[in-house]
């Protein structure tokens, strides 16, 4: 039975240029996790594997890092990035556990109504 | 000035699908995420999704997966909404509306589609 | 999903009352970068939602100064200073944060 629960950071609004930190966190559950995965849309950006550790699609490479802990920085933002980002857990004896976060990236200029946009 | 302009109502048959069309204008029409919003007897609201029409990244409530698919046409600046394998349950009025930039709400709403799922 | 629990369900008022209304999610809606995405709608019969604040506090354009918000966390008010007869309708609180974005159940403000 899966028990476990995962929480995000949250939808995040970004300027474009700027960085953010994705990170999703397993809680509730004693199961091992084995493997995670971050994913936009059907596209893979990383892996951090137990025993291997991390692995960046080649096409993320020069704009994605990886943690802090199990988390991905996205650097160099663009509107194209815009979009939603999953975090699945591997995990055994449960299985797979998925978390959402939708990160909309905004054209510098636009800071409408006094948005306070992240730029770490 | 923003303005959403839905299509009409619907009447249609159980194991039907369908699509609602939601024209935009009065905005850079790439720029905004468009939502949908469903409101089922007349009271309770739920998010059914968005699309970002820039890139056509979409984000789905698990809860309408496989009824509902959001679509955009950005040469005529308009979102449609397909509903699948329509019940009684899709009997609702649906909702366009434009997401705010910066802050994850909905500031300029289409005048709703009412949806009718009968025999 | 994130659950939005807004109180009271119905507010009888008379005009020029002052009137609160609650809306309580099951987790905080402050992301990790402190940013909270809250917002209020009003649902007039015949009419679209439309919005009248959003982060927590923010007036939309066109939104009268009696309507105002506050909280954070978990914990958010709508305050409406002067009831008006077009302030009558169902009103809603909205959560941002956390995928999928969830509606309260709504507060029907209705004359005594």
């Known amino acids: 039975m899966m028990t476990g629960t995962i929480e995000t950071t949250g939808n995040i609004s970004a300027e474009k240029g700027g960085s953010i930190i994705l990170q999703c966190h397993l809680s509730s559950t004693t199961a091992q996790v084995t493997q995670v995965n971050w994913e936009q849309q059907d596209q893979l950006l990383a892996i951090c594997n137990a025993d291997l550790g991390w692995h960046i699609s080649p096409s993320f490479k020069d704009r994605v890092a990886p943690g802090p802990g199990l988390g991905l920085t996205l650097q160099s933002l663009t509107v194209n990035d815009t979009g939603e980002y999953f975090c699945i857990y591997h995990t055994y004896p449960d299985g797979t556990y998925t978390g959402r976060i939708f990160l909309e990236v905004l054209e510098s200029s636009v800071a409408e109504h006094g948005a306070r946009f992240q730029i770490p | 000035e923003v303005q959403l302009q839905q299509s009409g109502p619907e009447l249609v048959k159980p194991g039907a699908s369908m699509k609602i069309s939601c024209k935009a204008s009065?905005?850079?029409?790439?720029?905004?995420?468009m939502n949908w919003v469903k409101q089922s007897h007349g009271k309770n609201l739920e998010w059914l999704g968005l699309?970002?029409?820039?890139?056509?990244?979409?984000s789905y409530n698990q809860k309408f997966t496989g009824k509902a698919t959001i679509t955009v046409d950005k040469s005529s600046n308009t979102t449609y909404m397909e509903l699948l394998s329509l019940t009684s349950e899709d009997s609702a009025v649906y909702y366009c509306?434009?997401?705010?930039?910066?802050?994850?709400?909905?500031?300029?709403w289409g005048q709703g589609t009412s949806v009718t799922v009968s025999s | 999903d994130v659950v939005m629990t807004q109180t009271p369900l119905s507010l009888p008022v008379s005009f020029g009352d002052q009137v609160s209304i609650s809306c309580r999610s099951s987790?905080?809606?402050?992301?990790?970068?402190?940013?909270?995405?809250l917002s209020w709608y009003l649902h007039k019969p015949g009419q679209s939602p439309h919005l009248l604040i959003y982060?927590?506090?923010n007036r939309f354009s066109g939104v009268p100064d009696r309507f105002s918000g506050s909280g954070s966390g978990t914990d958010f008010t709508l305050k409406i200073s002067t009831i008006k007869p077009e302030d009558l309708g169902m009103y809603y609180c909205?959560?941002?944060?956390?995928?999928?974005?969830?509606f309260g159940g709504g507060t029907k403000l209705e004359i005594k």
């Open positions: 009065g905005y850079s029409f790439t720029g905004y995420t």
């Open positions: 982060g927590i506090s």
């Open positions: 509306a434009r997401g705010l930039r910066g802050f994850f709400a909905l500031d300029y």
């Open positions: 909205l959560q941002g944060t956390h995928q999928p974005w969830t």
């Open positions: 987790q905080s809606l402050a992301n990790s970068y402190g940013n909270t995405y």
């Open positions: 699309i970002f029409p820039y890139n056509s990244a979409t």
